[in-house]
């Protein structure tokens, strides 16, 4: 069908609550495109009828709510005037008790589930709520170990819980809860967050911290399109540069002629005491020469790499 395949990271979510995923691929979706969602390679698109439990809402796929049987690979097909890209998203649904935030045993946990507070500082936790405009979110309540959080040190500000003068006792299992309204119906959204405390000031003075990647290999099929984010936390006043390099050369320079591998535009989210930066690397088409080569994310003096690896052959197919 001529569509390029792009494989996104797994998303792990809990059953019986709303979930939404936005089909965005900045090099493509910035222009005039059409987006269509499918499940498990089905030829029939996901419904656009807003009364359907699972439906497409503009570029989003929306589950109201997510159910146990919704696990699987979803594809969104982005068609432009001269291009077609198919983005694969693997959704894994798990059962979760309302106050159960200990999901550390699950693979590929998003950093939204694991947050850090800095000892002795004023810091904050963020309730990550990603939904289309059709969803209206009510005020957020915060819990720790299944009990509502209160006290003069805690302030709820929009999607954040501000914690003043962080102490060692603030570690533990938190949850944030909001009521989502869609087409007159109400749903409860609950996100679990495991919080650890670090004694380092800010994010280690001027030394940025690369959250992802973690010096590891990624299995990827030959010929596919791949996007890898480099996520970096750094102080607000930092002057560090963030970039992707290969063979000690900026990827944009190294692949200047073919432009087959490019660095994306850096974005950042501002928190109270630090910034979270994201800069991606896009492999438009993975070639044999890419395997075994360390692609380095640099952030100031910090570095982390990924190495592309061919998937192990599946002998069950023979």
């Amino acid at each position: 069908d001529g569509c390029k395949d792009i494989f996104m990271k797994n998303e792990i979510l809990s059953a019986s609550q709303p979930f939404a995923f936005n089909c965005t691929f900045p090099p493509i979706t910035s222009g005039e495109v059409s987006v269509t969602w499918y499940k498990n390679s089905s030829k029939i698109p996901v419904s656009k009828i807003i009364q359907s439990r699972i439906h497409q809402d503009e570029t989003w796929i929306l589950f109201l709510p997510m159910e146990w049987g919704d696990s699987g690979v979803y594809q969104c097909v982005i068609k432009g005037r001269d291009s077609c890209h198919r983005i694969h998203v693997n959704l894994t649904v798990f059962e979760k008790h309302w106050c159960d935030t200990s999901i550390g045993g699950l693979p590929n946990l998003s950093d939204e589930y694991k947050q850090i507070l800095h000892l002795g500082k004023d810091d904050s936790l963020t309730c990550h709520l990603h939904f289309p405009k059709s969803c209206v979110l009510g005020p957020i309540k915060w819990y720790k170990d299944c009990n509502e959080i209160k006290g003069e040190r805690f302030t709820v500000l929009e999607t954040r819980l501000l914690v003043s003068n962080v102490s060692a006792e603030d570690r533990g299992n938190y949850a944030c809860q909001a009521i989502l309204t869609h087409s007159g119906k109400q749903y409860e959204v609950l996100n679990g967050i495991t919080v650890s405390i670090t004694e380092r000031a800010g994010y280690g003075g001027s030394v940025p911290k690369i959250i992802y990647p973690k010096n590891h290999s990624i299995e990827v099929q030959l010929g596919t399109t791949l996007i890898v984010d480099c996520n970096v936390t750094d102080t607000k006043d930092n002057t560090n540069l963030r970039c992707w390099r290969v063979n000690n050369t900026l990827v944009d320079d190294y692949y200047d002629e073919s432009k087959r591998i490019r660095e994306g535009v850096e974005t950042h989210v501002s928190f109270r005491e630090h910034n979270l930066y994201t800069v991606n690397i896009t492999f438009l088409e993975v070639k044999m020469e890419d395997y075994g080569l360390p692609f380095m994310c640099h952030a100031g003096v910090s570095t982390a790499y990924i190495i592309l690896q061919l998937p192990a052959p599946d002998f069950r197919a023979y």
């Epitope: 106050c99 159960d100 200990s102 720790k144 006290g151 102490s167 006792e169 533990g172």
Partner: antibody, heavy 116, light 107 residues
Amino acid sequence: QVQLVQSGAEVKKPGASVKVSCKVSGYFFTSYWMNWVNQAPGQGLEWMGMIHPYDSETRLAQKFKGRVTMTVDKSTSTVYMELSSLRSEDTAVYYCASSTTAFAYWGQGTLVTVSS
Amino acid sequence: DIQMTQSPSSLSASVGDRVTITCRASQDIGNALNWLQQKPGKAPKRLIYATSSLDPGVPSRFSGSRSGTDYTLTISSLQPEDFATYYCLQYASSPYTFGQGTKVEIK
């Protein structure tokens, strides 16, 4: 260092009341719930209820509603548990336990003996 | 109320033995379960928080796990100082409830 220091042992007559204190140091007193747990001689642990020092919200086990009062003195970072209409089966060790994270720290216990 | 059924109520074991204690919750409590150790005349001490998180200073021979509504405390190699009574505690919803306790004695 977190410490929960409880008041000393008490001997009471049936029908009387007892007030046990639990003084907290080493963490932000008004940020976390405080639980009370009892243990009769040779028996297991039983949750009585909890109080939040910030606003004195209290939750009690059904068995203790009407007989237990939990209070807070923010100025001294102390929580109190008062048990009224004492009977012989209330003879037990009473513990306070903080929920900085669930039941992380415990007081040393206060033995209350109810005897005529 | 959520009932916690703990077994066995007592067990005899030797130093070096592997010991397992189980608690079954009458309904879903997620991972909101602690394991406590109590020695005679002393206050309980938390060993494990949130099903499997070891408290600071607790030896690594202690571990906690979960399968559905069954929760297990394992002592991989029993030491002389481990002879005590162990309790599970659910804090998913009040009233919080304890297991009946397991007394670990010297064989």
